[in-house]
C-alpha cells in the first residue's frame, strides 16, 4: 500500500513538475527589465527563450521572435537544448510511468517488470529535473554576468550632459517556475526510484524437495517461487485506473505597474 502511494505520489509530483518545465520553457519572462534605476519607465521590456517583448504603459504589447539560429548566443541555445531535453525525457518518463503504476493492470505484466519501468521512469524524471534546473541556472548566471557588466558600463563615461540609461535585465518569473518545476520533477523521480525498491519482489530461496519416482528422479520446485528476473503470472484482480491527470493552463504573471508618484 505504501509502495503504491509512493509511486502514485511520485507520478503526480513529476507530472506537475514537467507541466511546470513546459510552462517555463514557453514563458516570455525569463528576464525582465530591472526597474531599480528607472522605476517610472513607460516602456517595459522582457525576454524569453523564443522571443522578446515590449509592453508599453498604454497597454500595448509587442513581441518579436528570434528568427535566427546562428545569430543567437551559444548560452541561449544551450538553455533551449537543456529545457527541450528535459521536456522530452520527462514526457517519455511520464509515458513509461503510466504503464508502471501498480494501480493499473496491463495484460499479465509482472511486478518485477513494473519495478524496472518505475526505476526507468524515475531515472528519466531525475535527469529531466536536473536538465531544467541546469538550464534555468545557466540562464540566471548569464543574467547576473550581464547585469554587473551593464552596471559597470552605466557608471562610466557619463561626463556629458546627455544621459543614456542602459536597460538592465533581472530574473523573470519563468526562472522561478523552472527552478520549482525542476525540483518537483527531481523529487518525483526520487520517489519513483524508492517505490521501485518496494515493487521488486524479494527473491525467496525455497529448498528443492526431491521426490523419488520409479525409474527416474524428478526435481520439483513449489509454484510459489518467482525468479527475480520477472517471469511468472500475476493473476490477482487489480482496480483499473485511467490515470487521466490534467495539467493546469500556463498563467503568465506580469510584473506590477510601477506608478509614477
Amino acid at each position: 500500500m505504501a509502495v503504491t502511494a509512493c509511486q502514485g505520489l511520485g507520478f503526480v509530483v513529476s507530472l506537475i513538475g514537467i507541466a511546470g518545465i513546459i510552462a517555463a520553457t514557453c514563458m516570455d519572462q525569463w528576464s525582465t527589465q530591472d526597474l531599480y534605476n528607472n522605476p517610472v519607465t513607460a516602456v517595459f521590456n522582457y525576454q524569453g527563450l523564443w522571443r522578446s517583448c515590449v509592453r508599453e504603459s498604454s497597454g500595448f504589447t509587442e513581441c518579436r521572435g528570434y528568427f535566427t539560429l546562428l545569430g543567437l548566443p551559444a548560452m541561449l541555445q544551450a538553455v533551449r537544448a537543456l529545457m527541450i531535453v528535459g521536456i522530452v525525457l520527462g514526457a517519455i518518463g511520464l509515458l513509461v510511468s503510466i504503464f508502471a503504476l501498480k494501480c493499473i493492470r496491463i495484460g499479465s505484466m509482472e511486478d518485477s517488470a513494473k519495478a524496472n519501468m518505475t526505476l526507468t521512469s524515475g531515472i528519466m524524471f531525475i535527469v529531466s529535473g536536473l536538465c531544467a534546473i541546469a538550464g534555468v541556472s545557466v540562464f540566471a548566471n548569464m543574467l547576473v554576468t550581464n547585469f554587473w557588466m551593464s552596471t559597470a558600463n552605466m557608471y562610466t563615461g557619463m561626463g556629458g550632459m546627455v544621459q543614456t540609461v542602459q536597460t538592465r535585465y533581472t530574473f523573470g518569473a519563468a526562472l522561478f517556475v523552472g527552478w520549482v518545476a525542476g525540483g518537483l520533477t527531481l523529487i518525483g523521480g526520487v520517489m519513483m526510484c524508492i517505490a521501485c525498491r518496494g515493487l521488486a519482489p524479494e527473491e525467496t530461496n525455497y529448498k528443492a524437495v526431491s521426490y523419488h519416482a520409479s525409474g527416474h528422479s524428478v526435481a520439483y520446485k513449489p509454484g510459489g517461487f518467482k525468479a527475480s528476473t520477472g517471469f511468472g503470472s500475476n493473476t490477482k484482480n487489480k482496480k483499473i485506473y485511467d490515470g487521466g491527470a490534467r495539467t493546469e493552463d500556463e498563467v503568465q504573471s506580469y510584473p506590477s505597474k510601477h506608478d509614477y508618484v
Epitope: Q33, N38, V40, T41, A42, V43, N45, Y46, Q47, S52, C53, V54, E56, S57, S58, G59, F60, E62, R64, V162, Q163, T164, V165, Q166, T167, K257, D259, Y260
Partner: antibody, heavy 118, light 113 residues
C-alpha cells in the same frame, strides 16, 4: 466615430473646487488609459495624469499630486478630473486625451476653459 | 524628469518651402527592447486641441499627409515638412513617451508669409 466630449467653460472663485468631465464614445472606454493635459494661455502643454477606467488605476505628475483627482465612471463612459484649492495659476485650458500605441495621445477632447477669478 | 528642448521657438516660411524643426532630449528615448524611439510629434492649430502627427519618432499616424516626416534617434529628433501648405500654420510640440512624467517640449510656432 471616436469622440471625446468635454464639459463647458468654468468660471470659479479662488479656493473653490471644480470637476471637469470627458465623455468618451466610439471605443471600449474601459480598455484605454485616459489622460489629462493642461495648457495655460499662450503656453505649452503639461501632462497632469492618467486613469485606467477598467480598474481605476491612476498615475500622476508629481506637480499635480494633491491638486488633481482623477476618477472614471464605466457605466457612462465618462472620465472626471477634480481640481481643488484653485488659484489664478489654475486658469487654463484642460484637455482629456486617449492613450494609445507608442504611448501617444491619439484622440483629444475639444478642451475645457477654466477661469479662476474673484 | 526628461526635458525636451525645441528649436527654433518660431519660424516664418513661404508656402512650398521645406521646413525642419528640432527636438533635443535630456535622456535617450531609444528603447533597446524594440529599437524604437519613444518620441511623439503633435500639431496644434489656433483654437484647436493638439493633433497626433508622428509616434515612435518616425511613424506617421493614419490620415497625416506624407509631407510630414519624423526622424532621429536617441536624443536628437527632427520634424520635416516638405512643401509647407497654408493649413500647416500651427504650433508643433514633441513629447517624451518613454518615462513618467510624460513631458512636452515648449513648441515651435510655424508661421506662413
Amino acid at each position: 466615430q471616436l469622440q471625446l466630449q468635454q464639459s463647458g467653460t468654468e468660471l470659479v472663485r479662488p479656493g473653490s473646487s471644480v470637476k471637469i468631465s470627458c465623455k468618451a464614445s466610439g471605443y471600449a472606454f474601459s480598455n484605454y488609459w485616459m489622460n489629462w493635459v493642461k495648457q495655460r494661455p499662450g503656453q505649452g502643454l503639461e501632462w497632469i495624469g492618467q486613469i485606467y477606467p477598467g480598474n481605476g488605476d491612476t498615475k500622476y505628475n508629481g506637480n499635480f499630486k494633491g491638486k488633481a483627482t482623477l476618477t472614471a465612471d464605466k457605466s457612462s463612459s465618462t472620465a472626471y478630473m477634480q481640481l481643488s484649492s484653485l488659484t489664478s495659476e489654475d486658469s487654463a485650458d484642460y484637455f482629456c486625451a486617449r492613450y494609445y500605441r507608442g504611448n501617444c495621445f491619439d484622440y483629444w477632447g475639444q478642451g475645457t476653459t477654466l477661469t479662476v477669478s474673484s | 524628469d526628461i526635458v525636451l528642448t525645441q528649436s527654433p521657438s518660431s519660424l516664418t516660411v513661404t508656402a512650398g518651402e521645406k521646413v525642419t524643426m528640432s527636438c533635443k532630449s535630456s535622456q535617450s528615448l531609444l528603447n533597446s527592447g524594440n529599437q524604437k524611439n519613444y518620441l511623439t510629434w503633435y500639431q496644434q492649430k489656433p483654437g484647436q486641441p493638439p493633433k497626433l502627427l508622428i509616434y515612435w519618432a518616425s511613424t506617421r499616424d493614419s490620415g497625416v499627409p506624407a509631407r510630414f516626416t519624423g526622424s532621429g534617434s536617441g536624443t536628437d529628433f527632427t520634424l520635416t515638412i516638405n512643401s509647407v501648405q497654408a493649413e500647416d500654420l500651427a504650433v508643433y510640440y514633441c513629447q517624451n513617451a518613454y518615462t513618467y512624467p510624460l513631458t512636452f517640449g515648449a513648441g515651435t510656432k510655424l508661421e506662413i508669409k
